[in-house]
Amino acid sequence: IVLRPSRVHNSEENTMRALTLKDILNGTFSYKTFFPNWISGQEYLHQSADNNIVLYNIETGQSYTILSNRTMKSVNASNYGLSPDRQFVYLESDYSKLWRYSYTATYYIYDLSNGEFVRGNELPRPIQYLCWSPVGSKLAYVYQNNIYLKQRPGDPPFQITFNGRENKIFNGIPDWVYEEEMLATKYALWWSPNGKFLAYAEFNDTDIPVIAYSYYGDEQYPRTINIPYPKAGAKNPVVRIFIIDTTYPAYVGPQEVPVPAMIASSDYYFSWLTWVTDERVCLQWLKRVQNVSVLSICDFREDWQTWDCPKTQEHIEESRTGWAGGFFVSTPVFSYDAISYYKIFSDKDGYKHIHYIKDTVENAIQITSGKWEAINIFRVTQDSLFYSSNEFEEYPGRRNIYRISIGSYPPSKKCVTCHLRKERCQYYTASFSDYAKYYALVCYGPGIPISTLHDGRTDQEIKILEENKELENALKNIQLPKEEIKKLEVDEITLWYKMILPPQFDRSKKYPLLIQVYGGPCSQSVRSVFAVNWISYLASKEGMVIALVDGRGTAFQGDKLLYAVYRKLGVYEVEDQITAVRKFIEMGFIDEKRIAIWGWSYGGYVSSLALASGTGLFKCGIAVAPVSSWEYYASVYTERFMGLPTKDDNLEHYKNSTVMARAEYFRNVDYLLIHGTADDNVHFQNSAQIAKALVNAQVDFQAMWYSDQNHGLSGLSTNHLYTHMTHFLKQCFSLSD
């Protein structure tokens, strides 16, 4: 059982109130985290509540404002970035969102030495990406799909690329599919550690089919949004990696980095770039059939002025049971010798663990092991390696931070976080200063989140950075639901679940059950984190039991569970939700005539298939922005798990796994289908096709579209969405309004 904030005695119970939908929509019970913006081993910047940019020195205990809120306000800045030489700050304003990570903005450069904005050779607008060099104050930026370089903020720019074209050629920024499914960043350029070189990717989308949808806006005629978007099996972007010497870029020009021969022989992806030193770079490549990844270490040859990637420095990672990596192929963390590295990949037992690679992957030394998984390597110093895992007490949905001493032999392991605030904190991330002199721990739950500062040598807590006191006080008179995280053992499969129970839960009574599902490959829903959200309200106020179940295909419990769904999406994820529901019914407190399922995105796909499973278990369900056929979704994501939609590959399962193929089975359930018309990610096409199939089958259903809304259904649409879904569920469960 997970303990939430302590309950007051019965005498005070009449002052307690249930959560309301309004609480959720207003974000009344949202929490804060504190991530220091590290600028050295012992200093960090933080934006204060009144919007001053303050520099803190941990060792002297001093703090001072480096940029006043007045300066920030003068250009309506919402973000900032200090140059490493501390002479300049860029101020970001006019934020305009594009896709998940990408946005454009206007940038102003403020000179801290004279307290004035840099005049002359101002930056163009809007800029797609801008960053300082890691040393000094060089600037690289992307404008209209081309990369520019400034040696100093007041200098004129050197244009590095010239072929950038909207929706055709992208330099230094990813196209849609690379942004969403491969890099998970808004940028595709990387400075070398001392700023000597700048590496960048060029994506050529010339031959990619375009998704077009209407954006209605307010004009007489809607405009059409066109995005080069490769769906499963379609032509993919062509990627090339270049490196330019930023000291004298006009002389040698960009140098193209060679692709490993075994990768270049067929369609491939570039997956990440990691600088090791100024003259050594590591590139990761992936075959289009994503079970082979190659890590290539390239060296700058001064005498040739070229980047050499010898075959002896190519490391192959291959999966025989699924795809390479977890969600993404992991990235290496290099050690101080600048050639060996630490990397997470599957061990012989099928668990993702940290390995140390000195010469070849075959000779890798396993650093962690066990029937649990290493999740992230945060930092490697000369004597320590910091990582997170879900080892502690065998709960896959927890995250603790560990330190392995690599300076001593044999290496010793210490859990840094396991016993700090054991009841409150079981899910951590961390942020390290230079050389890991200090670090911040951010605890996400299950109790109220708290952020703390620690000494990197002793692990001692130095101070609390954010403890969410106001939230704690605000929750004192709220009847929060109870939460429990447990597991079901079914046919040699462990199904972890989280159950959210009404505050006055009584096992002898019957409650309506709502399953919330995501279920996508390498996802995890059952996590020991704090949240006051819509489902908290449904339990607290409406008396529902809500359950989240991690079935086959989900992450951090070994490859057997993860890769079970390989090449057959839509089968086991659904089966496992159904199995769990049957087990919940057996527990005796579920009203089996009032069971619903809902999900968003991949969860919308799973909930739709579950409703159409013909089991009769579900009375109703909701699909928000669901995938309906894997032929409609992005190549990079879909083919990772499904292969290609071709006759000689996996076309049959592509066809068998559609929602439309089960239209007939929706006849005996109440189905609410919801989608944004401007969804760039899971296209409205998906829901349009479900609706068409249901109409053709003469099956009644409910639907709601959100005009001009994307996959996130944000702003006022959020309020409308949750209000609408609440009404639907209450009607389904015969709950009075």
Partner: antibody, heavy 117, light 108 residues
Framework: EVQLLESGGGLVQPGGSLRLSCAAS????????MSWVRQAPGKGLEWVSG????????YYADSVKGRFTISRDNSKNTLYLQMNSLRAEDTAVYYC??????????WGQGTLVTVSS | EIVLTQSPGTLSLSPGERATLSCRAS???????LAWYQQKPGQAPRLLIN???RRATGIPDRFSGSGSGTDFTLTISRLEPEDFAVYYC?????????FGQGTKVEIK
Amino acid sequence: EVQLLESGGGLVQPGGSLRLSCAASGFTFSSYAMSWVRQAPGKGLEWVSGIIGSGGITYYADSVKGRFTISRDNSKNTLYLQMNSLRAEDTAVYYCAKGWFGGFNYWGQGTLVTVSS
Amino acid sequence: EIVLTQSPGTLSLSPGERATLSCRASQSVTSSYLAWYQQKPGQAPRLLINVGSRRATGIPDRFSGSGSGTDFTLTISRLEPEDFAVYYCQQGIMLPPTFGQGTKVEIK
């Protein structure tokens, strides 16, 4: 010792074509960007075109865009300039030079292209 | 495109004298992207000052480049007989790379 040796120049009628070659030696040819620069009789220098080491990026002066094509064969250590639809104003000594946008540190001896009827 | 204007068009000096050649850009260039070349009749140009005001390999130290923004100078501290030639400045910050029209340094 770095050497660049142009060839292929000569007399050609307006509208005609020529292909210039530049044989390189004394350095790792495939690593370096190369350019063509021309000089009309008694006039100054004009950059014509540039190509990076791998051949993957090329640029042209507006005056020759669409008519001239720069290319390279790294296995033969040779740079080329294919010139089509030649005009009288293309008459010049054509130099191949080692470099991208600037700092052309090695030049060939040049080859004369005369466009005349 | 960036226009580079060199002055004077011709400079008449005696051996041993100091020569100061000017190059003005139509927009800001910075020394990181400005080079100087020497060309003698019937010969190919020869790089003197590389981008970043660095002397090219084998160039005597009597040649030096300076300047920033839009105004640049090539200085020959003591003219030697072999220095009489045409000198060109060239910018490489913006496509297309452009050359000045040249300054002829002749024997007085």
